[in-house]
């Protein structure tokens, strides 16, 4: 895939020279990315920086070489020639090349992997060598208990002398195991710097010379035997380097074909893209993106609205610097540091931002660790929000400092801009919190439904066992009761959360919450009544059941009383919840006119095996799931469960008329249950599993 080029704009590799005393100098062939021997056949190692600069200018006469700088890491070069010898087959040598800098000096675009920090030091009173600044960078990282990951010179003040260094420090552990960032760097480093020079790609995870030096030499020596026979001119190396390119072209579309006309060069497109101002666009999202700031010559974050805007809009700082960092140095636009033909430049689109921690939570299906995942996502959300907020506050301070001499109206505009930013961030955080909580609630609800179904199935199965084992039945009943308890607890908690964050919505869903609590109540009543269809079991575990029911009633009293007296129920981490005012208003969940007591929400009242509760207005008669032929007029102990013929059940209907004059819209709530599992002995109890949860 060819990229249009202007003059020298499409060079494959950066101009650089390498020296090994006693051998002829080598220089990078910028057209094919291979090392070539000295064209004059005479020049060997040069010991002055001026001489190195001059040599660069000699071997690259067509380029405007203005300075040299030592490369950050050594490379292995084969085929060193001796003066006056045709045969150049010698040991490979591991040397640090000098980069020949073209045109106006532009600092390197350093990639900053995740969790790493970009730092720089400038000293206008110091003019020092590459080695000095490398040491400064290394020591600065060490002081912060981090590793030097990459570095570059700043502000040239002479030949291979500089007034500063930019560098990236990474956490100690990250260096060795952060494979992702290494991969990303390898993709980019070839495009922007190394051409087909595989040595650059190999070492790009850690460009600090000290690291992995011996390994690399050893590796090369092992391969050397093969090289001597097969690789007369380095084709093997070249092929290796081409592979990532082919992958890259599959992954992305070329600038040349997607965003430019045939007459427009890549240079012009990149220049145009990178010189546009950051544009939020008409939409109101707050997506954190990067743009190239021409006034400062580097990439900076901005908030993208989610639509419109322009192409100076990148997902990451690295990506932004890769596209714009070297291209926008102007003089380099005209010479070597161009997007290369090997790997088409990926220009940003205005797509949604990369998923963050919260998105990951939202995109991952719920599992047994739902609560832990939720807590983690919540913490990450708060941390992200705090970080963004403090960033904006820092920026605000800086902007106000710069604006202090501006007219009042302009100062006001700066302040207004940042006030809007802060409000917008707050709103975004609130929305994300809400989304997080709602997703969590939905997942918990789904899990509770599953657990309750399972518990109920196990309870029924235990009851139907021949012969039934009372202990086992009780254990299963206990688990079932706990599952229902959790459902009710969850429902109340959810309602409380909604009531705190959105009282209007709470008013709308209040009747549904009531209905759902009522459904739980009825379902538990029916489930318990099944126990009394197996009197032998019921009698044996009566005491424990009474105790269980008493506990359940106490629990319900506590939950509901707590809701009435204290409106705040913490939902895990209170940081997620807006703080409440001190007023403790009564929860308007229950009617207060006396017609509806706390008892109405208890699942059942304790009763003996011989006294089935009467069917009052507020209690639905338990469903006898037996076919009509096997059914007596009343459901009473002794009827037995063992002869259920589920295949004869097609539908179980239950009409529960709730008549309350307290303003709830739950009048004729018809609950229809289908025996969907016809043929299995569970069909009869499907009605008890209330699949359709009524809460919104």
């Amino acid at each position: 895939l060819e990229v249009p080029t202007d003059g020298n704009a499409g060079l494959l590799a950066e101009p650089q020279i390498a020296m090994f005393c006693g051998r002829l100098n080598m220089h990078m062939n910028v057209q094919n990315g291979k090392w070539d021997s000295d064209p004059s056949g005479t020049k060997t190692c040069i010991d002055t920086k001026e001489g190195i600069l001059q040599y660069c200018q000699e071997v690259y006469p067509e380029l405007q070489i203005t300075n040299v700088v030592e490369a950050n890491q050594p490379v292995t070069i084969q085929n060193w020639c001796k003066r006056g010898r045709k045969q150049c087959k010698t040991h490979p040598h591991f040397v640090i090349p000098y980069r020949c800098l073209v045109g106006e000096f532009v600092s390197d675009a350093l990639l900053v992997p995740d969790k790493c920090k970009f730092l720089h030091q400038e000293r206008m009173d110091v003019c020092e060598t590459h080695l000095h600044w490398h040491t400064v960078a290394k020591e600065t990282c060490s002081e912060k208990s981090t590793n030097l990951h990459d570095y570059g010179m700043l502000l040239p003040c002479g030949i291979d002398k500089f007034r500063g260094v930019e560098f990236v420090c990474c956490p100690l552990a990250e260096e060795s195991d952060n494979v992702d960032s290494a991969d990303a760097e390898e993709d980019d480093s070839d495009v922007w710097w190394g051409g087909a020079d595989t040595d650059y790609a190999d070492g790009s995870e850690d460009k600090v010379v000290e690291v992995a030096e011996e390994e690399e030499v050893a590796e090369v020596e092992e391969e050397e035997a093969d090289d001597d026979e097969d690789d007369e001119d380095g084709d093997e190396v070249e092929e290796e380097a081409e592979e990532p390119y082919e992958e890259a072209t599959e992954r992305t579309t070329s600038i040349a074909t997607t965003t430019t006309t045939t007459t427009e060069s890549v240079e012009e497109v990149v220049r145009e893209v990178c010189s546009e101002q950051a544009e939020t666009g008409p939409c109101r999202a707050m997506i954190s993106r990067w743009y190239f700031d021409v006034t400062e010559g580097k990439c900076a974050p901005f908030f993208y609205g989610g639509c419109g805007g322009n192409r100076n809009n990148f997902d990451t700082e690295e990506y932004c610097m890769a596209v714009c960092g070297s291209a926008m140095s102007q003089s380099l636009l005209k010479t070597t540091q161009e997007p290369l033909a090997r790997d088409p430049v990926k220009l940003p689109t205005t797509a949604a931002s990369t998923p963050d921690a919260v998105d990951k939570y939202l995109e991952t299906p719920g599992d047994e660790n739902e609560h832990a995942h939720f807590q983690k996502a919540k913490e990450r959300l708060e941390a992200k929000h705090r970080e963004r907020m403090s960033q904006v506050m820092r920026e605000w301070e800086e902007a106000e400092r710069q604006a202090k001499n501006l007219p009042k109206a302009d100062k006001k505009a700066v302040i207004q801009h940042f006030q809007e930013k802060v409000e917008s961030l707050e709103q975004e955080a609130a929305n994300e919190r809400q989304q997080l909580v709602e997703t969590h609630m939905a997942r918990v609800e789904a899990m509770l439904n599953d657990r309750r179904r399972l518990a109920l199935e196990n309870y029924i199965t235990a009851l139907q066992a021949v012969p039934p084992r009372p202990r086992h039945v009780f254990n299963m009943l206990k688990k079932y009761v706990r599952a229902e308890q959790k459902d009710r607890q969850h429902t109340l908690k959810h309602f409380e959360h909604v009531r705190m964050v959105d009282p209007k919505k709470a008013a709308q869903i209040r009747s549904q919450v009531m209905t759902h609590l009522r459904v739980i109540y009825e379902r538990m009543n029916q489930s318990l009544s099944l126990l009394y269809n197996v009197p032998a079991v019921a009698e044996e575990i009566q005491d424990e059941v009474d105790e269980l029911l008493q506990k359940e009633q106490n629990y319900s009293d506590d939950v509901l009383a707590n809701m009435i007296s204290e409106p705040r129920i913490s939902y895990g981490n209170d940081a997620l919840m807006p703080s409440l005012t001190e007023t403790k208003t009564t929860v308007e969940l229950l009617p207060v006119n006396g017609e509806f007591s706390l008892d109405d929400l208890q699942p059942w009242h304790s009763f003996g095996a011989d006294s089935v509760p009467a069917n009052t207005e507020n209690e639905v008669e338990p469903v006898d799931a037996r076919p009509a032929a096997d059914r007596g007029l009343t459901t009473r102990p002794g009827s037995g469960l063992t002869n259920i013929k589920t295949e004869e059940i097609s539908e179980v209907k239950m009409d529960a008329e709730f008549r309350h004059d307290s303003g709830y819209e739950v009048h004729h709530q018809k609950l229809v249950f289908f025996a969907e599992d016809v043929g299995s002995n569970k069909g009869a109890i499907i009605g008890l599993m209330v699949g359709g949860v009524v809460i919104a």
Epitope: E104, S107, E122, L154, L155, R271, E272, S275, E276, Q277, A278, E279, D293, V294, T295, E296, G297, K298, A300, P301, F302, F303, Q330, Q391, V392, E395, E398, A399, Q402, A403, N405, L406, D410, A413, V414, H417, F418, K421
Partner: antibody
Framework: EVQLVESGGGLVQPGGSLRLSCAAS????????MNWVRQAPGKGLEWVSY????????YYADSVKGRFTISRDNAKNSLYLQMNSLRDEDTAVYYC???????????????????WGQGTTVTVSS | DIQMTQSPSSVSASVGDRVTITCRAS??????LAWFQQKPGKAPKLLIY???SLQSGVPSRFSGSGSGTDFTLTISSLQPEDFATYYC?????????FGQGTKVEIK
């Protein structure tokens, strides 16, 4: 009083060099980006070069690239333009000009080139 | 590079007239445009920045409008001291570029 004063202009032969200086006073020099703008006799304004507050970004017009070097010394409140390989067409009045922007990582606003020096004349002639 | 084209290149007007000068950019520059006034032998003076914001101390008869590629400088009621040459300049990208200028002369 906010002021910019250029100096260093004069008559020079083609191929020669000159160094223009601009002394700033009355404002915090290090807080502003600076420009050189020139105007050939009877012609319009032509932007020459830009340098950011900390010298991290430097730009040149194509017509002077490789020949002119802009620099600044914030400690001395001074801006410089080193002009080498001068040509006839470089003859002009050279203005030093302050550019006001509020540029933070989240915010950019351009308030224009709001302060200009009186200009210094450079004549390139044999 | 972004080309800035001003029109007309000169305009003759009388005191009290409304004068409009336009400036067109060869590509979109958002609102990053400034207008300058220059009198013979003097340094330019900033009138308008960010397309429509009036520089402090500039009379309110001067106003700017436009965004994208088309911009206008309007002098609502020409005063004797307004006879000068006016330049537009884009600040969207480097190299910064000026329009060729519009000379406002006495009719």
């Amino acid at each position: 009083e906010v002021q910019l004063v250029e100096s260093g202009g004069g008559l020079v032969q083609p191929g020669g060099s000159l160094r223009l200086s601009c002394a700033a006073s009355g404002f915090t020099f290090s807080s502003y980006s600076m420009n050189w703008v020139r105007q050939a006799p009877g012609k319009g304004l032509e932007w020459v070069s830009y340098i950011s507050r900390s010298s991290s970004a430097i730009y040149y017009a194509d017509s002077v690239k490789g020949r002119f070097t802009i620099s600044r010394d914030n400690a001395k409140n001074s801006l410089y333009l080193q002009m080498n390989s001068l040509r006839d067409e470089d003859t002009a009045v050279y203005y030093c000009a302050r550019e006001t922007t509020v540029t933070t990582r989240f915010y950019y606003y351009y308030y224009g080139v709001d302060v200009w020096g009186q200009g210094t004349t450079v004549t390139v002639s044999s | 590079d972004i080309q800035m084209t001003q029109s007309p290149s000169s305009v003759s007007a009388s005191v009290g007239d409304r004068v409009t000068i336009t400036c067109r950019a060869s590509q979109g520059i958002s609102s990053w445009l400034a207008w300058f006034q220059q009198k013979p032998g003097k340094a330019p003076k900033l009138l308008i920045y960010a397309a429509s914001s009036l520089q402090s101390g500039v009379p309110s008869r001067f106003s700017g409008s436009g965004s994208g590629t088309d911009f206008t400088l309007t002098i609502s009621s020409l005063q004797p001291e307004d006879f000068a040459t006016y330049y537009c300049q884009q600040a969207n990208s480097f190299p910064r570029t000026f329009g060729q200028g519009t000379k406002v002369e006495i009719k």
